[in-house]
């Protein structure tokens, strides 16, 4: 009796759905009453299928209403774990364990990314020095570097701070500030670059002609 897992690594985006598979041998018609399926994530019970039905009693609260084992797939010898609205905390090693006469188990890793897609920006100016302060902020995971460039694609050094957002999701809140002498219509780019994946997202900032909100004089560097 051998389980096969078509993939042992799934990489998905935060907020999306994931379908992880463990296939087991079925001859003729599946006897659901003889089948036991456990899906576990470390010390958390995700799915328990025993005596022909899912037992929700052991299911860890973090998976409540989000983890499913489609029965139609079971009948085909496919123990599919569907997780909807994937959270960062869902990342980790899952174990599918199947007993159907014989038994076997497979370990599957789930990685969760949250791209820094939605980049908020702000431009302000210090009238005393005519220095502009450019700010880019975004949430994502894992950590990103912020690279500032001008219209000539030259790198500029900004000041980046990373904090863990206070949302339940524990996304990283990355803010970067560039202080620069600039004139109207100058173009700058901030790029959120995730080192490990190489993925990046860029926002364009254009110095406006109109006066921008002034910076307070007592700001600290």
């Amino acid at each position: 009796f051998t389980i096969t897992a078509p993939k042992d690594l799934y990489v998905v985006e935060y907020g999306s759905n994931v379908t992880m598979e463990c296939r087991f041998p079925v001859e003729q018609k599946l006897d659901l009453l003889a089948l036991v399926v456990y899906w576990e994530k470390e010390d958390k019970e995700v799915i328990q299928f025993v005596e022909g039905e899912e037992d929700l009693k052991p299911q860890h609260s973090s998976f409540r209403g989000r983890a499913f084992l489609p029965k139609d797939q079971l009948l085909k010898g496919n123990a599919v774990l569907q997780i909807t609205d994937v959270k960062l905390q869902d990342a980790g090693v899952y174990c599918c364990m199947i007993s159907y006469g014989g038994a076997d188990y497979k370990r599957i890793t789930l990685k969760v990314n949250a791209p820094y897609r939605k980049i908020n920006q702000r431009i302000s100016m210090d009238p005393a020095t005519s220095e502009h302060e450019l700010m880019c902020q975004a949430e994502g995971y894992p950590e990103a570097e912020v690279i500032w460039t001008n219209s000539d694609h030259q790198s500029l050094s900004g000041e980046t701070t990373v904090t863990t957002s206070q949302t339940e999701e524990k996304l990283l809140n990355v803010t970067s500030v560039l202080r620069v002498n600039a004139t109207a219509n100058d173009v700058f780019h901030c790029t959120f670059w995730r080192v490990h994946s190489g993925e990046n997202h860029t926002a364009e900032l254009i110095i406006p002609e109109l006066p921008v909100p002034r910076l307070p004089h007592n700001r600290t560097h």
Epitope: Y38, K44, E45, P58, A103
Partner: antibody, heavy 118, light 109 residues
Framework: EVQLVESGGGLVQPGGSLRLSCAAS?????????WGWIRQAPGKGLEWIGI????????NYAQKFQGRVTISRDNSKNTLYLQLNSLRAEDTAVYYC??????????WGQGTLVTVSS | DIQLTQSPSSLSASVGDRVTITCRAS??????LNWYQQKPGKAPKLLIY???SLQSGVPSRFSGSGSGTDFTLTISSLQPEDFATYYC???????????FGQGTKVEIK
């Protein structure tokens, strides 16, 4: 090759505590597998105490030991720990740490003997 | 709680003999059952996992079978290095626990 080395055994007074260490090499304790403690009293069988999981550090303990056992780890030292309190003579045993796969334990340390006696 | 009872508790056999050890569960269980070998003064060694799968590096003379309440470990042709104590162990997902049988000692006749 995974290697586990237990230490910290010896003579302990009844009512006292023990803290055993298990140094792992050849595999990171924060990756993938769970890690367990099992004991064996002299001339007796194997008895599962508890396990700790890699990333979140969650634990499960055998009902018998609930309330007086703590399993912890230090990822930077790649070391597991077993703390057992309120010791009595029947806690005299060889204590093993082991790596857990899906259903059982595939790598074991050599064990460390704890004797509870006054 | 599920109890595992091994039989016999001990047995005497000769090199070349076929040896069968039984592990009986107090109620029907999934086949998440393992077998270990332990030699005096040594740590246990995993032989069979999930009732019938041979652990990597274990000689093919060891095999496991069974389901429900009755599981067996068979040594097809006993070798001198096989004289040891054998334990069955069951895994339960919820509440999470690992239960061992009391052991079967295989001695030289």
């Amino acid at each position: 090759e995974v290697q586990l080395v237990e230490s910290g055994g010896g003579l302990v007074q009844p009512g006292g505590s023990l803290r055993l260490s298990c140094a792992a090499s050849g595999y990171s304790i924060s990756s993938g597998y769970y890690w367990g403690w099992i004991r064996q009293a002299p001339g007796k069988g194997l008895e599962w105490i508890g396990i700790i999981y890699p990333s979140g550090g969650g634990t499960n303990y055998a009902q018998k030991f609930q309330g007086r056992v703590t399993i912890s780890r230090d990822n930077s030292k790649n070391t597991l720990y077993l703390q057992l309190n309120s010791l009595r003579a029947e806690d005299t045993a060889v204590y093993y740490c082991a790596r857990g796969g899906g259903l059982g334990f595939d790598y074991w340390g050599q064990g460390t003997l704890v004797t509870v006696s006054s | 709680d599920i109890q595992l009872t091994q039989s016999p508790s001990s047995l005497s056999a000769s090199v070349g003999d076929r040896v069968t050890i039984t592990c009986r569960a107090s109620q029907s269980i999934p086949s998440f059952l393992n077998w270990y070998q332990q030699k005096p003064g040594k740590a246990p060694k995993l032989l069979i996992y999930a009732a019938s799968s041979l652990q990597s590096g274990v000689p093919s003379r060891f095999s496991g079978s069974g389901s429900g309440t009755d599981f067996t470990l068979t040594i097809s042709s006993l070798q001198p290095e096989d004289f040891a104590t054998y334990y069955c162990q069951h895994y339960i997902s919820w509440p999470r626990q690992f239960t061992f049988g009391q052991g079967t000692k295989v001695e030289i006749k």
